[in-house]
């Protein structure tokens, strides 16, 4: 799932369809924050794992998804926009296997932004696709408060101030 100006997109074999309500969670839009006008066509970059995925150069492939690791540093919101402008989104980690893959490919021990931030609207940690974090799988170390964003370091997730500048990971 990727996000455009308040519209969720469902990608089905490379084609896009607008969806204002899903039966499972009733999604209407995704997350709170700065949005750029990116066309639905551009945004429809996600592919399911069972499809053949060709990752762009400099992107790593894993389990049907493509990953890009930055070398420069930005705030969380600037990282968020950077990924969107490249038809991707900040990293959403689904399980510990994916976390292990990420960690293996991180070449430094510093914090790296992922697509998770705290929203005081629902008082929860929320992935950039609008889904809440599964507390049975992941534990976030640090404060859960407004302007808290998540960064990973050594396979752990930490709460950091969103204005801090770190490297980041994009995914599609």
């Amino acid at each position: 799932l990727l996000v455009s100006q308040g519209v969720l997109l469902k990608c089905q074999k490379g084609s896009c369809s607008n969806a204002t309500q899903y039966e499972d969670t009733g999604d209407l839009k995704v997350n709170n924050g700065t949005r750029r006008n990116i066309s639905n066509k551009d945004l429809c970059a996600s592919r399911s794992a069972d499809q053949t995925v060709l990752c762009q150069s400099e992107w790593l492939k894993y389990q049907g998804k493509c990953y890009w690791f930055s070398n420069e540093m930005k705030s969380w919101s600037d990282s968020y926009v950077y990924c969107l402008e490249r038809k991707s989104h900040l990293l959403i980690i689904h399980d510990q296997l994916e976390m292990a893959f990420i960690q293996k490919n991180l070449r430094q021990l510093n914090y790296v932004w992922i697509g998770l931030n705290f929203t005081s609207l629902k008082m929860t940690w929320t992935w950039v696709d609008g889904s809440p974090i599964d507390s049975k799988i992941f534990f976030i170390k640090g404060p859960a408060k407004e302007n808290s964003c998540a960064a990973i370091k050594e396979s752990k997730i930490f709460s950091e101030t969103c204005s801090s500048v770190f490297k980041w990971i994009c995914q599609y």
Epitope: D24, T25, D27, L28, K29, N31, L121, K122, M123, P132
Partner: antibody
Framework: SLEESGGRLVTPGTPLTLTCTAS????????MNWVRQSPGKGLEWIGA?????SAYYASWAKGRFTISRTSTTVDLKMTSLTTEDTATYFC????????????WGQGTLVTV | QIVVTQTPASVSAAVGGTVTISCQSS????????LSWYQQKPGQPPKLLIY???TLSSGVPSRFKGSGSGTQFTLTISDLECDDAAAYYC??????????FGGGTEVVVK
């Protein structure tokens, strides 16, 4: 879908628990609200419970109302009921990322 | 305590006409836009019309228009139809998990 149950005629001071049962989705990923409507009056937010199980209440409801949940039900426990609590009680699910309630139950009537 | 004031309490207009409902919050809404509008008919639960102040919910005709930001919001219903006769409520979402409804506006279509 959502369905409220437990509403009935009670005497003042009697405690009562209302249950909201969800089908087709898990409440563990939902932000669920309880809203009430007295006869001929407007909608009044009572409180909510988030995906992490934390509950939030309107200032007037704190202490007398308690919201809890399982994967398929959200309960509203009410104590020290008065005639002012006579109302239809609705549960509603918010969209994943806004405060808009895009799924409502039909409501259950509590008469005190 | 959050107070959401909705005006007018009741409004009447002819078929084909336009009605405007105002909603004012005592506190800034989350992101300045976390305002929804609902339509409710007797014996039914509310129905979501507009979210994020101005975004139409699925299946809602474009005759319904939401605007505003911060603490002041407006719902405009143009080209009124008989079926639009109902109660309309605004609702705000706030930091800290808080929510609040306006007092409601009864729309009568002549």
């Amino acid at each position: 879908s959502l369905e409220e149950s437990g509403g009935r005629l009670v005497t003042p001071g009697t405690p009562l628990t209302l249950t909201c049962t969800a089908s087709g989705f898990s409440l563990f990923s939902a932000y669920m609200n309880w809203v009430r409507q007295s006869p001929g009056k407007g909608l009044e937010w009572i409180g909510a419970i988030n995906s992490g199980g934390s509950a939030y209440y309107a200032s007037w409801a704190k202490g007398r109302f308690t919201i809890s949940r399982t994967s398929t039900t959200v309960d509203l426990k009410m104590t020290s009921l008065t005639t002012e609590d006579t109302a239809t009680y609705f549960c509603a699910r918010e969209a994943a990322d806004t405060s808009a309630n895009n799924l409502w139950g039909q409501g259950t009537l509590v008469t005190v | 305590q959050i107070v959401v004031t909705q005006t007018p309490a009741s409004v009447s207009a002819a078929v084909g006409g336009t009605v405007t409902i105002s909603c004012q919050s005592s506190q800034n809404l989350y992101g300045n836009k976390e305002l929804s509008w609902y339509q409710q008919k007797p014996g039914q639960p509310p129905k979501l019309l507009i979210y994020l102040a101005s975004t139409l919910s699925s299946g809602v005709p474009s005759r319904f228009k939401g605007s505003g930001s911060g603490t002041q919001f407006t719902l405009t219903i143009s080209d009124l139809e008989c079926d639009d006769a109902a109660a309309y409520y605004c609702a705000g979402g706030y930091s800290g998990g808080m929510r609040a409804f306006g007092g409601g506006t009864e729309v009568v279509v002549k």
